[in-house]
Interface confidence: medium
């Protein structure tokens, strides 16, 4: 229903704490370079204004849209042009164009240093002195680095952060308590960030219909006992919520997400038998729990999918009379029977089914033509199954680091024009799929692997779009979202690439590598590996193994030496010479 004052309505629905958190996230995602202090000042001003509107909805400016209010605040920032250049041009526009302009200037790879976690003692001190400010900094730092992070979910992670600090800061060994717990929150949050970016990409590039199809498949897998109309209602709501968050309408998004959780908990009987535990939790935890809910049990007596979609003599009539309903029902029925498939695979199958009907229903004998359609799904199903099998076997053989290196070599050969930092980031993330998915039971592996890889490859596409350098990557990224992963998997060594000249300085290392944390050490080595492949794209696995083994020994030896600097200075050139020889 329409409210006199949108901002008052959201403030009342969300409560002051969540309202402030969401406004902070919104500002941090739009203006990613501004310091925390500047944003928090704006947040306080917006909050004070919202309170005046709660007290009197007819007060001046209270009837303005939230985009107008937020945009006016951002555009009033002094030195906006100095800090943000052409983003300041957005301020000359009217809503809704101004907001669209802000969205287009969101930077997926802002030039910000990696978020460094302070020492445990220092962290606990600042948390205990001012928990609100501490968590505010967390929201700000994550939001500015991930401008599409799902805002209500980020509030949930801040709550988790709060819980961990509250618990661990009273322990005698704070670091031992904090490190594993915060690492787990960070890992989950980073995965959430790439998943949400994929959802926003889907919405931006292919529109609501494509996103809704994704949601229907996902909901059908989770809630196989819910009927199609229920699934569609949930998918429609989830689509609206994601559209709002991707579009910067964070207050509305969070409010609608809470509403959806309420609806699901009030309608458990028609949705799923697994919801009760989630429904007893407070709002942020409830929504998160519902988003991560395990699949309900599949009904025992489901008939064969062929009955309605192959054997029924009215298939073409049903398809012609109500295409979306018919195809939507097919996707629902297939998905609820296959929690063991990835959403991407289910959407590929639905697309194949649609293409078959388009072709066959125009022919003389449609049933004979579409009669084999389910058998024709087989190669589409086998391809990702083989991908999972071979990659999990490789992961089990090499471990995470070794598997990341294998992926790095593979992807550098596929797209050697892509910048080394982007390749290393992508390979490290792709390589984590092993740890994340290969240890799961067989039935959960495929959905875990393929949907995770799709999200990581979307990140690669988003970064590549900013500075396109590889035609092959552009081709895979321009096609349909569900075909991306198979497209990348099918890429081979780029024969058009002219190998990079060998530059000794690329492979020159200093004693500072010795004091780096393990992760940073790995990144240094992986950077060298990518550069080697760019120099010799057709190097064999054995050649690369030799050079990298040599390199690891060299670092290990010099880091143990009494005079580290001298060791690096003298042994380094020898290593470069041996490497060149090994790769000749």
């Amino acid at each position: 229903e329409a409210h006199k004052s949108e901002i008052a309505h959201r403030f009342k629905d969300l409560g002051e704490q969540h309202f402030k958190g969401l406004v902070l996230i919104a500002f941090s995602q739009y203006l990613q370079k501004c310091p925390y202090e500047e944003h928090i000042k704006l947040v306080q001003e917006v909050t004070d204004f919202a309170k005046t509107c709660v007290a009197d909805e007819n007060a001046e400016n209270c009837d303005k849209s939230i985009h107008t209010l937020f945009g006016d605040k951002l555009c009033a920032i002094p030195k906006l042009r100095d800090n943000y250049g052409e983003l300041a041009d957005c301020c000359a526009k009217q809503e809704p164009e101004r907001n669209e302009c802000f969205l287009q200037h969101k930077d997926d790879n802002p030039n910000l240093p990696p978020f460094q976690r302070p020492e445990a003692e220092a962290m606990c001190t600042s948390f205990q002195e001012n928990p609100t400010s501490f968590l505010g900094h967390y929201l700000h730092e994550v939001a500015r680095r991930h401008p599409y992070f799902y805002a209500p979910e980020l509030l949930y992670y801040a709550e988790k952060y709060n819980e961990v600090l509250t618990q661990c800061c009273t322990e005698s060994d704070k670091a031992a308590c904090l490190t594993p717990k915060l690492d787990a929150v960070k890992e989950k949050a980073l995965v959430a960030a790439v998943r949400q970016r994929m959802k926003c990409s889907s919405m931006q590039r292919f529109g609501e219909r494509a996103f809704k199809a994704w949601a229907v498949a996902r909901m059908s897998q989770r809630f196989p006992n819910a009927e199609f109309a229920e699934i569609t209602k949930l998918a429609t709501d989830v689509t609206k919520i994601n559209k709002e968050c991707c579009h910067g309408d964070l207050l509305e998004c969070a409010d609608d997400r809470a509403e959806l959780a309420k609806y699901m908990c009030e309608n458990q009987a028609t949705i799923s038998s697994k919801l009760q535990a989630c429904c007893d939790k407070p709002v942020l935890q409830k929504s998160q729990c519902l988003a991560e809910i395990e699949h309900d049990n599949i009904p025992a007596d489901l008939p064969s999918i062929a009955a309605d979609f192959v054997e029924d003599k009215e298939v073409c009539k049903n398809y012609a009379e109500a295409k979306d309903v018919f195809l939507g029902t097919f996707l629902y029925e297939y998905s609820r029977r296959h929690p063991d498939y990835s959403v991407s695979l289910l959407l590929r199958l639905a697309k194949k089914y649609e293409a078959t009907l388009e072709k066959c229903c125009a022919e003389g004998d449609p049933p004979a033509c579409y009669g084999t359609v389910l058998a024709e799904f087989q190669p589409l199903v086998e391809e990702p199954k083989n991908l999972v099998k071979t990659n999990c076997e490789l992961y089990e053989k090499l471990g995470e680091y070794g598997f990341q290196n294998a992926v790095l070599v593979r992807y550098t050969q596929k797209a050697p024009q892509v910048s080394t930092p982007t390749l290393v980031e992508a390979a490290r993330n792709l390589g984590r799929v092993g740890t994340k998915c290969c240890t799961l039971p067989e039935a959960q592996r495929l959905p875990c692997v393929e949907d995770y890889l799709s999200a990581i490859l979307n990140r690669l596409c988003v970064l590549h779009e900013k500075t396109p350098v590889s035609e092959k990557v552009t081709k895979c990224c321009s096609g349909s979202l569900v075909e991306r992963r198979p497209c990348f998997s099918a890429l081979t060594v780029d024969e058009t690439y002219v190998p990079k000249e060998f530059k000794a300085e690329t492979f020159t290392f200093h004693s500072d590598i010795c004091t780096l944390p393990d992760k940073e050490k790995q990144i240094k080595k992986q950077t060298a590996l990518a550069e080697l492949v760019k120099h010799k794209p057709k190097a064999t696995e054995d050649q690369l193994k030799t050079v990298m083994g040599d390199f690891a020994q060299f670092v290990d030896k010099c880091c143990k030496a009494a005079d580290k600097d001298n060791c690096f200075a003298t042994e380094g050139p020898n290593l470069v010479a041996r490497s060149k020889e090994a790769l000749a």
Epitope: E227, A229, T232, P299, A307, F309, A322, V325, F330
Partner: nanobody, 116 residues
Framework: QVKLEESGGGLVQAGGSLRLSCVGP????????MGWYRQAPGKERELVAF???????NYNDAVQGRFTISRDNAKNTVYLQMNALKPEDTAVYYC??????????WGQGTQVTVSS
């Protein structure tokens, strides 16, 4: 637009029985809640009964114990068995579903007249 077709209506004495049938696309009937509604002259359309894909049924208090809704998936049909009919059951009976992505699908209706 999805098409639903009702049949089985007619004129019957109070206390008598009728069985209404609704035929529609199998994929729709199996995946969605199907309902029977009725509209008496000069009155609002009201829900009589519905059946979920799981087989779960629900009835208007006025017909509880007298009417039975069922489905035959092999025949793509939903039935409404009406026993102990009363004059106040006189109405046009409509078969209904709400397929997602579309407006509600209604049949053309079948007239039931109960004389006293």
């Amino acid at each position: 637009q999805v098409k639903l077709e009702e049949s089985g209506g007619g004129l019957v004495q109070a206390g008598g029985s009728l069985r209404l049938s609704c035929v529609g696309p199998g994929f729709l009937l199996r995946s969605n809640t199907m309902g029977w509604y009725r509209q008496a002259p000069g009155k609002e359309r009201e829900l009589v009964a519905f059946i979920r894909p799981s087989g779960l049924t629900n009835y208007n208090d006025a017909v509880q114990g007298r009417f039975t809704i069922s489905r035959d998936n092999a025949k793509n049909t939903v039935y409404l068995q009406m026993n102990a009919l009363k004059p106040e059951d006189t109405a046009v009976y409509y078969c209904h579903t709400r397929p997602p992505f579309q407006r509600d699908s209604w049949g053309q209706g079948t007239q039931v007249t109960v004389s006293s």
